[in-house]
């Protein structure tokens, strides 16, 4: 958890509560759900539904939970331990790409090409050539058919903290 | 981007005063420590103190205690090293850095860095 922090990743500031939970770190390390004492001594307990940490750590907060933006669904809550987990609604999909945003799946497959995957939340419809079996690249066609699909909507996490 | 700017460094006599300042942006994280480190010619990074800015803790080498002064202005976001009774082992290039890890002494806790500046201790 030390490497690949960003700024924006971390909580508002904030002192830690009387009702915090406190223990004793660990050569030098709390456990995940807590963060470190400025002087090193204490493990003080994340804020459930606000921050967490998923691993050992000697930080001096917890990392801020994610929200979920609109156009998501959110599959689990943030707890001390675990980031929320958020994803697509039905009919939009996330790629690899472009992370930050739901993008809507296509209705239909261009001309010459049927459907062999449906739209799930981390996939658009995937389209193939009739003949060769050849994938399509997945630029939205000048002209589609009118070949729909049913949206999928298996579970899939949009953003892990593992 | 996290920048940090060190200036006050000089010559001074032996049992003078100086003070460094630390100019320190970009910084967003809600808690972390500042600290100042050396590196005396031909030798290593040495810890000198470190201030934390959520609780104000402040740690200090052996070497320095009683003689150094580690404060902090939180509204310029800049820290300070007020020295006295300096030696000519205190000569050095001072370092400003900032951790987000507590209890931190060791280099290796520091993510940010700054250029340094140079005091120099002679008669």
């Known amino acids: 958890e030390s490497a690949l922090i960003t700024q924006q990743d971390l909580a508002p500031q904030q002192r830690a509560a009387p009702q915090q939970k406190r223990s004793s770190p660990s050569e030098g390390l709390c456990p995940p759900g807590h963060h470190i004492s400025e002087d090193g001594r204490d493990c003080i307990s994340c804020k459930y539904g606000q921050d967490y940490s998923t691993h050992w750590n000697d930080l001096l907060f917890c990392l801020r939970c994610t929200r979920c933006d609109s156009g998501e669904v959110e599959l689990s809550p943030c707890t001390t331990t675990r980031n929320t987990v958020c994803q697509c609604e039905e009919g939009t999909f996330r790629e690899e790409d472009s992370p930050e945003m739901c993008r809507k799946c296509r209705t239909g497959c261009p001309r010459g090409m049927v459907k062999v995957g449906d739209c799930t939340p981390w996939s658009d419809i995937e389209c193939v050539h009739k003949e060769s079996g050849t994938k399509h690249s997945g630029e939205v066609p000048a002209v589609e058919e009118t070949v729909t699909s049913s949206p999928g909507t298996p579970a899939s996490p949009c953003s892990l903290s593992g | 981007e996290v920048q940090l700017l060190e200036s006050g460094g000089g010559e001074v006599q032996p049992g003078g005063s100086l003070r460094l300042s630390c100019a320190a942006s970009?910084?967003?994280?809600?808690?972390?420590?500042m600290s100042w480190f050396r590196q005396a010619p031909g030798k290593g990074l040495e810890f000198v103190c470190a201030i934390y800015w959520s609780g104000g803790t402040v740690y200090y080498a052996e070497s320095v205690k009683g003689r150094f002064t580690c404060s902090r202005d939180n509204a310029k976001n800049t820290l300070y090293l007020q020295m006295s009774s300096l030696r000519a082992e205190d000569t050095a290039v001072y370092y400003c850095a900032v951790t987000i890890r507590g209890a931190a002494t060791q280099t290796w806790k520091y993510d940010y860095w700054g250029q340094g500046t140079l005091v120099t201790v002679k008669p």
């Open positions: 970009g910084l967003t994280f809600p808690n972390y420590g």
